[in-house]
């Protein structure tokens, strides 16, 4: 906090310019008009102030706008954005994507800070949904952004926005999130032909149900093992050996290396050993020949 002192004669700032770096903190406080500062915030971003000087400028803006900064000021905050608390940011009403981009640029290369998380939350809530342009912007700055959202938040993503999603954006998503995103992706890509469709939908398949996997197995997609290992266990279990063979194509040989890991391990336990043997991979653990398999879940449903 800088003491309130009168501005020395001749030092009253008429504009925000480089001469202000020669002002001491108390002089900045006394000689820079907050309203002038607010209208010329863009100039602050071209002047090499010290962090202490910037603290004084922030203090002046806080006094001028106790209810929160207007967007005209927010857009030009630059480094000062990093000095804001989440409480400060919750007072803002940010509607312009250009403002969002300008502030994300300041934090570029760093982890998502509490300030950035709060800013994004305010922005998305203000828009009512995660539209394509917003999602494009956010995933460009933070590839993991999508997977940081709860399933409830993801439900506000319109299918049209899914086109902006890259495979790496989904790397850290868990099954609950993919359960929400997969139907949106299916809808978004529904008019594409077989091979193109598979390329686009592949990253989302961790949310796919059994019937969709069965359908894909009829389309010669040659799913790689990495994708297969991310499928929902409950969606893989009902697949037959023939269906898995068709789904994986030449990658089926990779099952051997994964036979102790889910979902392959659990799937093997559900298959007849005879059927597994037809793959010629030496997979063990299937149901021995002559055993009868009762599906108790089906029996319960019927009763």
């Amino acid at each position: 906090e800088v003491e309130k002192t009168a501005c020395p004669s001749g030092k009253k700032a008429r504009e925000i310019d480089e001469s202000l770096i020669f002002y001491k903190k108390w002089e900045l406080e006394a000689c820079v008009d907050a309203a002038l500062l607010a209208t010329q915030m863009d100039r602050v971003n071209a002047i090499p102030f010290t962090y202490e000087q910037l603290d004084v400028l922030k203090h002046k803006l806080d006094e001028l706008y106790p209810q929160g900064y207007p967007e005209s000021v927010i857009q030009h905050l630059g480094y000062l954005f990093l000095k804001m608390s989440p409480e400060d940011i919750r007072k803002w009403n940010v509607t312009s994507l250009e403002t969002l981009k300008a502030l994300l640029e300041v934090n570029k290369g760093h982890e998502m800070s509490p300030q950035v998380a709060t800013l994004i939350d305010r922005f998305v809530k203000g828009r009512g949904q995660l539209d394509k342009d917003t999602l494009d912007t956010l995933t460009a700055f933070y590839p993991g952004y999508l997977c940081s959202l709860s399933p409830e938040e993801l439900s506000s993503v319109p299918p049209s926005s899914i086109w902006a999603v890259r495979p790496q954006d989904l790397d850290t998503c868990d099954p609950r999130q993919l359960d929400v995103l997969y139907p949106k992706a299916r809808l978004a890509f529904q008019n594409m032909n077989g091979s193109e469709y598979f390329v686009k939908i592949q990253s989302f398949l961790g949310g796919a149900p059994t019937e969709d996997l069965k359908a894909l197995s009829q389309q010669n997609v040659s799913m790689d093992l990495a994708t297969f290992m991310k499928l929902r266990t409950d969606a893989v279990l009902p697949l037959t050996v023939a269906e898995v063979q068709k789904l994986l194509g030449p990658h089926v040989e990779g099952l051997k290396a994964e036979e102790r890991h889910r979902p392959v391990r659990d799937w093997i336990l559900r298959q007849r050993q005879d059927d597994l043997d037809t793959l010629g991979l030496g997979l063990q653990g299937g149901i021995p020949n002559g055993y009868l398999v009762l599906d108790l879940s089906m029996q319960e449903a019927l009763s």
Epitope: N45, I47, P48, F49, T50, G78, A102, E105, V106, K108
Partner: nanobody, 115 residues
Framework: LQLVESGGGLVQPGGSLRLSCAAS????????IGWFRQAPGKEREGVSS????????NYADSVKGRFTVSRDNAKHTVYLQMNSLKPEDTAVYYC??????????MGQGTSVTVS
């Protein structure tokens, strides 16, 4: 973002020193740079500034005519040439920079003693 100052040392009154400011982990080329100094027990004060192109320079009254700020973008370095040094120039000298989107950087300082 970190800036690194060098070139400080002990010099006699009337002597000269050249301080350098370089960037660590990024390039200084599109950064406007300010030189500041802080004497023991005093507030940090601005000494000089230079625009990102080098076309515009400014000086505090106390160093005008004695100090010259320049930059060599090929070497990604900004310099502060200090001539006719006085005992009152004794301080830790810092550089601070501002780049695109208001990104900021500041150094840890280099000590200058005129005695």
């Amino acid at each position: 973002l970190q800036l690194v100052e060098s070139g400080g040392g002990l010099v006699q009154p009337g002597g000269s020193l050249r301080l350098s400011c370089a960037a660590s982990g990024f390039t200084l080329d599109n950064y406007a740079i300010g030189w500041f100094r802080q004497a023991p027990g005093k507030e940090r004060e601005g000494v000089s500034s230079i625009s990102s192109s080098g076309g515009s320079t400014n000086y505090a009254d106390s160093v005008k005519g004695r100090f010259t700020v320049s930059r060599d973008n090929a070497k990604h370095t900004v310099y502060l040439q200090m001539n006719s040094l006085k005992p009152e120039d004794t301080a830790v000298y810092y550089c601070a920079g501002v780049g695109a989107y208001g990104r900021r950087a500041m150094g840890q300082g280099t000590s200058v003693t005129v005695s």
